[in-house]
């Protein structure tokens, strides 16, 4: 069964800056990745970035830099101030659409006990929805 992992890290140098890393553990071909915050995409969450393996990357504030790390993992740097700034308990979700498995989504947030600059290892997060 495919799995999605999500890792959230607060940067030690900038406390309003977060890095989200997501990956897909499956054998299928990824056709689209959607990163959202505040909940799953389409279920109250707001899209931060869309990454297509061949069409490129689109992102919206407070997303600063989204990129492919490998063919099955992505990273997104967020920075904000005021209303658009993420906070420590913000939930971030990554949805991977793949063929033939379908869509798989998982969410994560900053580990409550982590210090800035530290994070939990990128372990698979609970799968919230598989379409």
């Amino acid at each position: 069964t495919p799995e999605v992992w999500v890792q959230v890290r607060m940067e030690a140098t900038e406390l309003s800056s977060f890095t989200i890393r997501c990956g897909f553990l499956g054998s299928g071909s990824i056709s689209l990745v959607t990163v959202s915050w505040g909940g799953p995409n389409g279920a109250g969450g707001t899209t931060l970035a869309v990454l297509h393996p061949e069409r490129g990357i689109r992102q919206w504030a407070p997303a600063r830099q989204a990129r492919w790390e490998t063919q099955s993992s992505i990273s997104l740097i967020l920075e904000g101030s005021g209303a658009s700034s993420p906070c420590a308990n913000t939930t971030f979700c990554c949805k991977f659409a793949s063929f033939p498995e379908g869509s798989w989504e998982a969410c994560g947030s900053l580990p409550p006990s982590s210090d800035p600059g530290l994070s939990a290892p990128p372990t698979p997060a609970p799968i919230l929805r598989a379409d």
């Epitope: 707001t46 899209t47 297509h52 393996p53 061949e54 069409r55 490129g56 990357i57 689109r58 919206w60 504030a61 990129r67 492919w68 790390e69 490998t70 063919q71 992505i74």
Partner: antibody, heavy 114, light 113 residues
Framework: QVQLQQPGAELVKPGTSVKLSCKAS?????SYWINWVKLAPGQGLEW???????????NYNEKFKNRATLTVDTSASTAYMELSSLASEDSALYYC???????WGQGTTVTVSS | DIVMTQSPSSLSVSAGEKVTMSCKSS????????????LAWYQQKPGQPPKLLIY???TRESGVPDRFTGSGSGTDFTLTISSVQAEDLAVYYC?????????FGGGTKLEIK
């Protein structure tokens, strides 16, 4: 089927503003971002900016950032681009395009003339 | 901004001939993470909006005839029409799909003799 509908033409006076519309149909409006593209006579295509209706957040080409304003009305499934302080060089065909530019409206011809 | 330069600016060929047009970018359009080139080609026929032909430098959009082929990597890209048809009369644009702002080339106008 996915469609983007734009009015055919707008005639405006120099120094004024124009608000162009792009009505979407055939898909969930909030799941697909809208781009705006300029095609001036004898010139190539220029990307003005994009907006994600789900978050109301735009990105702008720096060249247009001070004069273009992108907005959406999700209840009407419509995206708007307002262009201010119009001059003759703004006379052009303005397209909206969905997502990764895979669906285009027919374009609105803006003529700036006194 | 990434500058996209197309050549030639125009060309005139007879139906059935092979056509090649070039697009060069001022920065690499290769994504190092997944080794994909983020370049697209569009066809704009007179009186119509642009139509997506090729994305990812070489992947044909659904419904596009296989006489259209995209190739290249990094900063140098090519669109080839293997056997030009009368309906291919159009302006062809390449586009940086890699990073904001999404710049287009100046276009290559294809005329049929």
């Amino acid at each position: 089927q996915v469609q983007l509908q734009q009015p055919g033409a707008e005639l405006v006076k120099p120094g004024t503003s124009v608000k162009l519309s792009c009505k979407a149909s055939g898909y969930t409006f909030t799941s697909y971002w809208i781009n705006w593209v300029k095609l001036a006579p004898g010139q190539g295509l220029e990307w003005i900016g994009d907006i994600y209706p789900g978050s109301y957040i735009p990105n702008y080409n720096e060249k247009f950032k001070n004069r273009a304003t992108l907005t959406v009305d999700t209840s009407a499934s419509t995206a708007y681009m307002e262009l201010s302080s119009l001059a003759s060089e703004d006379s052009a065909l303005y397209y909206c395009a969905g997502g990764y530019f895979d669906v285009w409206g027919q374009g609105t011809t803006v003529t700036v003339s006194s | 901004d990434i500058v996209m330069t197309q050549s030639p600016s125009s060309l005139s060929v007879s139906a059935g001939e092979k056509v090649t047009m070039s697009c060069k970018s001022s920065q690499s359009l290769l994504s190092s993470g997944n080794q994909k080139n983020y370049l697209a080609w569009y066809q704009q026929k007179p009186g119509q909006p642009p139509k997506l032909l090729i994305y990812g430098a070489s992947t044909r959009e659904s419904g596009v005839p296989d006489r259209f082929t995209g190739s290249g990597s990094g900063t140098d890209f090519t669109l080839t029409i293997s056997s030009v048809q009368a309906e291919d009369l159009a302006v062809y644009y390449c586009q940086n799909d890699h990073s904001y702002p999404y710049t287009f080339g100046g276009g290559t106008k294809l005329e049929i003799k």
